[in-house]
């Protein structure tokens, strides 16, 4: 009985299509696969960013796989051919591993890359990123931002930079069509006459960095003698009501401060007969049903009511 063997895939490589971290892992079928024509050959692919303890493992019948990586670090991958037990009248047969690595040759020392990169997707409409220049770089250093997400056929450069003293320190993005719920890749590279500048790579999803506008139209009505209903409206813009969570800060007579989180645009507050004045502010954030993370809006304008006046309105 001859032992069944299978070769590893050929030409296994990690291909960078220029999408700032979204890479293709590609390979060719092994040599002598025609012996297994009646068989569905599979490939086990393992990959990770260098430095990561865990491998991502994929089993596929295809000759390619795509995923996002952190280009600030190197990437390593390995693949082997699998012949399922149905093909071998027994146990699964595996080839030896084929291996591939990829990294972007770093230019410049790490300190030259941008510092404190911060991106906010204002009201789920306007993306703005800002950064500080690298440590010890001269004024002749300028930084350029490029971005890509699935749906763009190539990486695009920022066209509206925020400048201070002629130096780019941020980018106002144009309208980004169909850009949420997918990885958004950014590279900030730089140039200087005096020394090479290190590039920085960032990946996030836009729905997770949304900072909504504050709620508006704050109102207050007395439902009964000791119950007050606070109401507000969702801010103008594309974010649907179901996506908000709110934080309310309530002050009674300049003393008692209550902070609470609610899921709809109303909150019923119990007061005592001692309460004379009521003030509240509200802020909003995208909730866990619409994103994994978010940024609280600014607080709304403070609204205050005299409880006596509210009671008069209720009696009328």
């Amino acid at each position: 009985d001859t032992e069944i063997k299978v070769n590893p895939p050929q030409d296994f490589e990690i291909v960078d299509p220029g999408y700032l971290g979204y890479l293709y892992l590609q390979w060719q079928p092994p040599l002598s696969l025609d012996n297994f024509k009646e068989c569905t050959v599979e490939y086990e692919l393992k990959y990770r960013n260098i430095g990561s303890e865990t491998w991502t493992t994929i089993i596929t019948k295809n000759l390619h796989y795509k995923d996002g990586f952190d280009l600030n670090k190197g990437i390593e991958a390995k693949i082997h051919t699998l012949l399922p037990w149905q093909c071998t009248n027994g146990s699964e047969v595996q080839s030896s591993w084929a291996e591939a690595t990829y990294w972007i040759s770093p230019q410049g020392i790490p300190e030259t890359k941008v510092q404190d990169m911060d991106c906010v997707y204002y009201n789920w409409q306007y993306l703005l990123c800002s950064w500080k220049p690298g440590i010890g770089v001269l004024l002749d250093t300028n930084y350029n931002l490029f971005y890509w997400y699935e749906g763009l056929d190539r990486a695009l450069q920022c066209v509206d930079y925020i400048k201070v003293d002629g130096q780019n320190i941020g980018c106002r993005f144009p309208y980004l069509e169909s850009s949420d719920y997918k990885d958004f890749y950014i590279c900030v590279n730089g140039s200087s006459e005096t020394k090479p500048i290190r590039s920085s790579y960032f990946t996030f999803q836009l729905q997770n960095i949304v900072k909504p506008l504050p709620p508006v139209c704050l109102t207050c009505t007395q439902e009964s003698l000791y119950e007050i209903k606070l109401k507000w409206s969702i801010p103008l813009g594309p974010i649907p009501a179901r996506c908000f969570v709110y934080e309310i800060e309530i002050r009674e007579d300049d003393t008692t401060l209550v902070t609470t989180t609610v899921e709809n645009e109303t909150y019923t507050l119990k007061i005592t007969n001692e309460t004379r004045q009521l003030c509240f502010v509200v802020r909003s954030k995208v909730n866990i049903y619409c994103s994994d993370d978010g940024i609280w809006s600014e607080w709304s304008d403070k609204q205050c009511w005299e409880v006596e006046e509210l009671l008069k309105k209720t009696l009328l």
Epitope: Q10, D11, E13, I14, V15, D16, P17, Y24, Q26, Q28, P29, L31, S32, L33, D34, N35, F36, K37, V41, K61, L63, H64, A100
Partner: antibody, heavy 122, light 107 residues
Framework: EVQLVESGGDLVRPGGSLQLSCAAS????????MSWVRQTPDRRLEWVAT????????YYADSVKGRFTISRDNARNTLYLQMSSLKSEDTAMYYC???????????????WGAGTTVTVSS | DIVMTQSHKFISTSVGDRVSITCKAS??????VAWYQQIPGQSPKLLIY???YRSTGIPDRFTGSGSGTDFSFIISSVQAEDLALYYC?????????FGGGTTLDIK
């Protein structure tokens, strides 16, 4: 429509150099291995060189090793063949060809360009 | 290197005939053989790969068979437009070599 268009062929003296280019369109260039295949005046086909989809793997025929360099620019969808120390036996029609790939096989050529003529003569 | 030998340089046939072109490999290449057609004045065109698989859009009058070292390419009913040079090529391991070609002549 899948298309390969070669250019750069010329009449060159023995020992001279030449660069051929192949512009690809109508398919995802970075997903396919690419090759140069030449056809000699006596109509024989000879595989010259192959480069893998990402450019990491390169294969040459013994007859051109050390003299020819195959390369690709996936951003420009272009394949190149840099030829140096040219000999009269390099005279041929040079075709750019896409490497076909199926689940079980590869290294055949499923799309060919119209070719560009290289004549090496004094 | 694997040598691919097409023993017939010319085959003369008539429209409607069945014609067979053979190709022999100097060593076992499994089923890694492709067949190409080159019409005069045109570049080669893939007809068959992996010995018996027709390329996209190729009429079913063209078939291929064989494994190991002996391969054949058959046109079941020759048409006038089939006048061409036919080449076999192994796609087993580098270097990938071609046969010398067989010219199909229509009487």
């Amino acid at each position: 429509e899948v298309q390969l268009v070669e250019s750069g062929g010329d009449l060159v003296r023995p020992g001279g150099s030449l660069q051929l280019s192949c512009a690809a369109s109508g398919f995802t260039f970075s997903r396919n291995g690419m090759s140069w295949v030449r056809q000699t005046p006596d109509r024989r086909l000879e595989w010259v060189a192959t480069v893998s989809s990402g450019g990491s793997y390169i294969y040459y025929a013994d007859s051109v090793k050390g003299r020819f360099t195959i390369s690709r620019d996936n951003a420009r969808n272009t394949l190149y063949l840099q030829m140096s120390s040219l000999k009269s036996e390099d005279t041929a029609m040079y075709y750019c060809a896409r490497q076909g790939t199926t689940a079980l096989a590869t290294r055949f050529f499923d799309v060919w360009g119209a070719g560009t003529t290289v004549t090496v003569s004094s | 290197d694997i040598v691919m030998t097409q023993s017939h340089k010319f085959i003369s046939t008539s429209v409607g005939d069945r014609v067979s072109i053979t190709c022999k490999a100097s060593q076992d290449v499994g089923t890694a053989v492709a067949w190409y057609q080159q019409i005069p004045g045109q570049s080669p065109k893939l007809l068959i790969y992996s010995a018996s698989y027709r390329s996209t859009g190729i009429p079913d009058r063209f078939t291929g068979s064989g494994s190991g070292t002996d391969f054949s390419f058959i046109i079941s009913s020759v048409q006038a437009e089939d006048l061409a040079l036919y080449y076999c090529q192994h796609h087993y391991s580098a270097p990938w070599t071609f046969g010398g070609g067989t010219t199909l002549d229509i009487k």
